[in-house]
């Protein structure tokens, strides 16, 4: 309803005109164009693509399109000294070596500059020792090993399967356990869906396929050498020893054919339970070391990658707002890929390209959005969200004053089953209303709305008749905007059926087999799911930039705050005796949530009734909505994580990809029964309850009548 009420909107130039201009065929064409060669961050090929996108966005009609460059720490394998892992015999002879590259997919045999599989930012080293299998290398896996099984990983090389949690958390956990090296592998239990063929005959991971990826623990810092500040021409850079988040032990990824050779010889303890077994024909013994006949053999890693300060390029396009040019709605996604980027990121970049083209078409016909829209093609996302973070650090003062919303646009698909949305509660109603107006692309839902198919296939666990919307975690470019700056953020993509497909991510994630053909043959031949994602992302941007009253509903924040308070309280109540002993009370938090609920309700009533023709009052009300997300930011940040400043949400300390609610309290309570000083530990719980209660109350007050 709100869009075509905007002052400069004629009936022709409404949301429908924007959506109708989006074409599946264009997205397909753009995806093909973006995926013919690798676009690794820091390479000439990715610089050329940045310039191409800059040129095309200008042609599409944006007001300005600039490149923003930064010199950041990246990591590459040594071209003449490849990384690999060996099994060595008692004489030190290498009797087995893992492969040096993935067999290239058909049609790509002669492509140069395919970076071999590596773990970005691994230090150099050639550790050798006994192997310990650590399952997914999650916090709970190491608890099981160390506490229950009494297995010591100190001085061992650990082998962990990919999946469940961000790989950087796995490496951090292994380091803390005293390991001297980490081997990461893709188990078919997680990366091979039953009944589907391996690429190129299907979308499953072949045995020689390997997942690349960074293994940093940046906690939102951006460039490891310039935390908090842009990596510009006059930047002061830390020494490598003081760099943020770098791993201290060598790490290397392998495929399941190579993993089979390492795991089949494992001896020592049997796996503790079936959850430690994958799908390979190996015992999944934990170790340490190899069994009987092979007990004198060891594993040796050979890692020679180098960290290098390298120039990266963001593309920033501007479509100036007609009424509120100083209010920014941002649509951003990354451009850099590990290899061809068939899904990650180019399925997202192609959608952004088509959204820009559609907005440009409207602008050429005389239309402008109410608010300014910024479009971003980020660089070096794969190396730690570096491009987006450096740009946000450089522009933080503008963003914190003018940033209305950030919509992320990485991979448009990770499956073709249903929609998946993660966003701030402020956007729930926007997403609901928008998806009710869009057609579902799903088979069996012809003529039905996207909302209907999404709700049917992915129902909310709390509210019947509504779809699941998840918390924002991290591992993508919205991180700096949401977790550091407190700008309302959201993301949407098409996903798999999580019920039937238990594998992690999509099987060919970050492998050489993530090609255009993977998408065109197996995931989305008609590009109808891409088009739907373009409509959702583009539609959200359109509404956020164009509606007279910002499409945020603060009452939805009140609902989730109560849910999160209940959840953290019940976690704490697992320790009733200690809560009594140390006088731990959640009363202040529940009181603050109650106040927030009441004030949000009153604010919503005023929002319905105020005089929208009064630009000052309109701006005032919109500012209260815009700054609500900002009000959840604690300038001091979370303990030991200064760039995670949102008090309601943060990436889980155990899995960067997952969002945690009331993270300060959650972390203070985590494993509290094992703390050496319970008094101090419970004191920190109380402090975190205080911080959370204060923040919720302070946020509530920003919604009160101003005078």
């Amino acid at each position: 309803k709100s869009s075509n009420e905007a002052t400069n909107i004629t009936p022709k130039h409404n949301m429908k005109a924007f959506l109708d201009e989006l074409k599946a065929e264009n997205i397909k064409k753009f995806l093909y164009n973006f995926t013919q060669i690798p676009h690794l961050a820091g390479t000439e090929q990715n610089f050329q693509l940045a310039k191409q996108i800059q040129s095309q966005w200008k042609e599409f009609g944006l007001d300005s399109v600039e490149l923003a460059h930064y010199d950041v720490l990246l990591s590459y394998p040594n071209k003449t000294h490849p990384n690999y892992i060996s099994i060595i015999n008692e004489d030190g002879n290498e009797i087995f070596n893992t492969s040096l590259f993935e067999p290239p997919p058909p049609g790509y045999e002669n492509v140069s500059d395919i970076v071999p599989p590596f773990s970005a930012f691994s230090p150099q080293g050639m550790p050798e020792g006994d192997l310990v299998y650590v399952n997914y290398a999650r916090t709970e896996d190491f608890f099981k090993l160390e506490r229950d099984m009494k297995i010591n990983c100190s001085g061992k090389i650990v082998i962990a399967r990919y999946g469940k949690v961000f790989r950087g958390n796995k490496v951090k956990n292994a380091q803390l356990a005293g390991a001297k090296g980490v081997i990461l592998y893709s188990d078919p239990a997680d990366y091979f869906a039953p009944g589907v063929k391996s690429y190129p005959d299907g979308w499953n991971l072949p045995g020689g396929g390997v997942q690349r990826g960074n293994i940093l623990n940046l906690n939102g810092a951006g460039d490891p050498l310039t935390p908090g500040y842009p990596a510009n021409e006059y930047a002061y850079r830390r020494g490598i020893a003081e760099a943020v988040g770098l791993p201290s032990i060598p790490v290397h990824p392998i495929g399941y054919y190579d993993a089979q050779k390492l795991l089949e010889k494992m001896g020592g303890s049997a796996p503790p339970d079936s959850s430690w077994r994958g799908s390979l024909k190996v015992p999944y013994n934990v170790g340490p070391g190899f069994t009987g006949n092979f007990s004198t053999q060891k594993v040796k890693m050979h890692i020679h990658s180098t960290n290098e300060v390298t120039r990266i390029y963001n593309v920033i396009g501007t479509l100036r707002g007609a009424v509120e040019p100083d209010r920014y709605v941002i649509l951003g996604g990354h451009r850099d890929s590990w290899v061809f980027g068939g899904i990650d990121p180019q399925s997202g970049a192609a959608v952004v390209h088509e959204i820009v083209r559609s907005f440009g078409t409207l602008k050429k016909e005389g239309w402008r959005p109410r608010r300014t829209i910024l479009f971003a093609s980020w660089d070096a996302e794969e190396f730690g969200l570096l491009g987006s973070t450096e740009w946000a650090e450089e522009n933080s003062r503008l963003l914190q004053e003018r940033g209305v919303a950030y919509i992320n646009a990485d991979s448009s698909i990770e499956g073709n089953y249903t929609l998946r949305v993660d966003c701030t509660p402020l956007m729930y109603s926007l997403v609901h209303n928008l998806t009710k107006e869009l057609k579902s692309p799903d088979e069996g839902f012809e003529g039905k709305s996207l909302y209907e198919s999404w709700t049917k296939k992915s129902p909310s666990p709390e509210f019947s008749g509504m779809p699941r919307i998840s918390k924002l975690g991290s591992g993508n470019d919205f991180e700096v905007f949401f977790q550091r700056l407190g700008i309302a953020s959201g993301r949407a993509r098409y996903t798999k059926n999580w019920e039937t497909n238990k594998f992690s991510g999509y099987p060919l994630y970050h492998s050489v087999y993530e090609t255009y053909e993977l998408v065109e043959k197996f995931y989305d031949p008609m590009f109808k799911y891409h088009l739907t994602v373009a409509q959702v992302r583009g539609g959200m941007v359109f509404e956020l930039a164009n509606s007279i009253v910002l499409p945020f509903d603060c009452r939805d924040y009140a609902v989730v705050l109560r849910k999160y308070a209940d959840k953290i309280y019940s976690i704490s109540m697992k320790h009733p005796q200690e809560m009594k002993t140390y006088s731990v009370s959640f009363d202040s938090l529940f009181s603050a949530v109650k106040n927030f609920t009441e004030i949000a309700s009153k604010f919503s009533e005023r929002l319905q009734d105020f005089d929208k023709s009064n630009p000052i009052v309109l701006r005032m009300m919109n500012d209260q909505l815009m700054f609500l997300e900002r009000a959840f930011i604690d300038p001091l940040g979370l303990p030991d994580r200064p760039f995670y400043r949102h008090v309601i949400y943060a990436p889980s300390s155990h899995n960067k990809y997952a969002g945690e609610s009331f993270p300060g309290i959650y972390d203070a309570l985590f494993d509290i029964e094992s703390k050496v000083d319970p008094s101090k530990a419970w004191g920190e719980v109380k402090r975190q309850i205080y911080v959370a209660a204060f923040t919720v109350q302070a946020a509530a007050e920003t919604l009160s009548e101003v005078a």
Epitope: I87, I95, F96, S99, P103, P188, F192, G207, G208, Y256, Y257, Q260, K261, A270, S274, R277, G278, S279, L280, K281, V282, P283, Y284
Partner: antibody, heavy 120, light 111 residues
Framework: QVQLVQSGAEVKKPGASVKVSCKAS????????INWLRQAPGQGLEWMGG????????NYNENFKGRVTLTIDKSTSTAYMELSSLRSEDTAVYFC?????????????WGQGTLVTVSS | DIVMTQSPLSLPVTPGEPASISCRSS???????????LHWYLQKPGQSPQLLIY???NRFSGVPDRFSGSGSGTDFTLKISRVEAEDVGVYYC????????FGGGTKVEIK
């Protein structure tokens, strides 16, 4: 496509040795074990042993231990089976077969077979 | 070693009719990882064996869907829903959970 090509038929005297080759192509040789099996005239299949080209590790059927030796030449992607102290009951067709890795873990590609005749 | 026992030894069939072959192992074929590595091969006259079914019930590439496998633990069955002339040959069950062993074979011939 995956191919296993075996050497030609052999006639041997009792007490002699025979060495059969199996040249692999169409896949990464080091990823897949090679099994050797035999089939006596009108009989079923009998597994003799297997070798892993990746590390040279071998497994032998107890019935053949000491008489069979499996080797590989990575440079030519060739596997070899040598059977010594031949006797007339060793007359059989000898097959090499690739041990399919995940998800098969079955012998998914076979050589054409090599007839070895042991006769005085 | 695991002993694999197939029945019947010989199976005369009429084209278009179904056929069923049974295979029993001397001990469980369930691997510690939960998978059962029981496979079926067909050796056509004068040819090398070829893989038909792997891990009990999965058809290998190019195998017609008239072939199906089932069973668990120690008892397994291969079924041909409608026998065709080209299906003649000797069918072997085999296990690779332990040291590989084969059944004695079932000769399928047209009546």
């Amino acid at each position: 496509q995956v191919q296993l090509v075996q050497s030609g038929a052999e006639v041997k005297k009792p007490g002699a040795s025979v060495k059969v080759s199996c040249k692999a192509s169409g896949y990464t040789f080091t990823y897949f074990d090679i099994n050797w099996l035999r089939q006596a005239p009108g009989q079923g299949l009998e597994w003799m042993g297997g070798i892993s080209p990746g590390d040279g590790n071998t497994n032998y059927n107890e019935n053949f231990k000491g008489r069979v030796t499996l080797t590989i030449d990575k440079s030519t992607s060739t596997a070899y089976m040598e059977l010594s102290s031949l006797r007339s009951e060793d007359t059989a067709v000898y097959f090499c077969a690739r041990d399919g890795n995940f998800p098969y873990y079955a012998m998914d590609s076979w050589g054409q077979g090599t007839l070895v005749t042991v006769s005085s | 070693d695991i002993v694999m026992t197939q029945s019947p030894l010989s199976l005369p069939v009429t084209p278009g009719e179904p056929a069923s072959i049974s295979c029993r192992s001397s001990q469980s074929l369930v691997h510690s990882n939960g998978q059962t590595y029981l496979h079926w091969y067909l050796q056509k006259p004068g040819q090398s064996p070829q893989l038909l079914i792997y891990t009990v019930s999965n058809r290998f590439s190019g195998v017609p869907d008239r072939f199906s496998g089932s069973g668990s633990g120690t008892d397994f069955t291969l079924k041909i829903s409608r026998v065709e002339a080209e299906d003649v040959g000797v069918y072997y069950c085999s296990q690779s959970t332990h040291v590989p062993t084969f059944g004695g074979g079932t000769k399928v011939e047209i009546k």
